[in-house]
């Protein structure tokens, strides 16, 4: 991979340990927590990042679930099990043998159960809605300029192919970014929308995952765009399976 050779660091993931012990003395970086080798030319998977984060825990967060099939990360942080490719394993369990099924972004999509719970496949999150509220400004941002700036950001900072940014909606002060990526659309080497959304979420919170890069400085025609709250909704290719008790709660 293309980790910086001079000082051997991982530009796309500061939660790594790097050393020149790769083939031919090349810089090789491993994620904290899992020890898995990461490709520093692209985003690290959310599963490995969460695992690394749990090796230096911070406060969990809670979000609100808006509708029947849209999932929000209500459960906050947990120490996930990742497969050899760094993806979430379909079934996650905690230390007390409580288990649940997750989607490809690691968000719980079933009721919690015991060790007998089966999660047959990792269900893909194919549609992510990032809902932002920006701080008050003198006037509304120009919609086209705002739209282009956010699309540029996802291309340049997160390396997300432009075809996966489906839409940018704006009704001051609310901005919605829609990311869509079906299993059939995602080619080898494409950044996953779940990973891009996670990096963006951390950037917005001032917790950038990038090494040696400034924090996110969003500007629209030079005007700062300051986000005061973020909600992220996840839609899966197969609807989640929660009991009626939860749905009516």
């Amino acid at each position: 991979h293309t980790a910086a050779q001079d000082n051997c660091t991982c530009p796309t993931n500061k939660m790594t340990v790097c050393s020149p012990d790769g083939p031919g003395g090349r810089c090789q970086c491993r994620a904290l927590g899992s020890g898995m080798a990461v490709d520093c030319s692209t985003l690290t998977s959310k599963c490995l990042l969460l695992k690394a984060r749990m090796s230096a825990p911070k406060n969990a967060r809670t979000l609100v679930r808006p509708s029947e099939h849209a999932l929000v990360d209500n459960d906050g942080l947990y120490d996930p099990d990742c497969d050899p490719e760094g993806r979430f394993k379909a079934r996650q369990c905690n230390q007390t043998s409580v288990c649940w099924c997750v989607n490809s972004v690691g968000v719980r999509r079933t009721d919690k159960g015991d060790l007998s719970l089966r999660c047959d496949e990792l269900v893909r999150t194919h549609h992510i809605l990032i809902d932002l509220r920006h701080r008050p400004t003198a006037g509304a941002f120009n919609h086209s300029d705002l739209d282009a700036e956010l699309r540029r950001l996802f291309r340049e900072r997160y390396r997300l192919h432009p075809k996966f940014v489906a839409a940018v909606h704006y009704e001051q002060p609310t901005i919605q970014i829609e990311l869509r990526q079906n299993t059939s659309q995602k080619a080898a080497g494409d950044v996953d929308i779940g990973d891009a959304a996670y990096y963006f979420e951390r950037d917005i919170k001032g917790e950038s995952l990038f090494q040696g890069r400034g924090g996110l400085d969003l500007r629209v025609r030079g005007e700062p765009l300051q986000v005061e709250r973020t909600l992220i909704y996840y839609l899966d290719e197969i609807p989640p399976k929660f009991s009626m008790k939860r749905l009516t709660a």
Partner: antibody, heavy 117, light 106 residues
Framework: EVQLVQSGPEVKKPGASVKVSCKAS????????IGWVRQAPGQGLEWIGE????????YYTEKFKGRVTMTADTSTSTAYMELSSLRSEDTAVYYC??????????WGQGTLVTVSS | DIQLTQSPSSLSASVGDRVTITCSAS?????MYWYQQKPGKAPKLLIY???TLASGVPSRFSGSGSGTDFTLTISSLQPEDFATYYC?????????FGQGTKLEIK
Amino acid sequence: EVQLVQSGPEVKKPGASVKVSCKASGFTFTDYVIGWVRQAPGQGLEWIGEIYLGSGTIYYTEKFKGRVTMTADTSTSTAYMELSSLRSEDTAVYYCARGSIFPFDYWGQGTLVTVSS
Amino acid sequence: DIQLTQSPSSLSASVGDRVTITCSASSSVSYMYWYQQKPGKAPKLLIYDTSTLASGVPSRFSGSGSGTDFTLTISSLQPEDFATYYCQQWSSYPYTFGQGTKLEIK
């Protein structure tokens, strides 16, 4: 094979408009971005703006805002850049270039626009 | 706008020489891109993400740098390398190019 084929040279009078076309092939047109860059004779490269072909989202640089219009015809996989109120300093080669996770990965061959009275 | 200043503006060198072109940004950028342009032709992507060679680019080309200072190096000049080289950023709108470095045969 990715190709961007631009329209032929144009000679225009000051105050007139010019519309340069860029026909794309070898890739899914609406998945990408087309940027426009110009180069005055003997000078460097100057970015004009870009259009997201799937959504029609456009960004123009401040310098060209109000004078430039970028459009795309998805049925023919062709992008267009129209520049109005032409002046002599607009004489340049105009390039279209495809954007993806790179700003410009493939370029058209260029279209020479000459503005002369 | 982020200004990019290339140095030198022109350079005379011989086949086999090692050549270095620098690009200085007026404020920090994430990555630098480098293009090669030959007379009468469109620019060609040479290096992306500061140091990664574009497809088909010979290994004698290399890129490095971070923040505001970036470098393009040609380890051993070949006859086909005589051209104009441009750096470019897209860390913020508008995308900007350096003024170019013309590499001529001595």
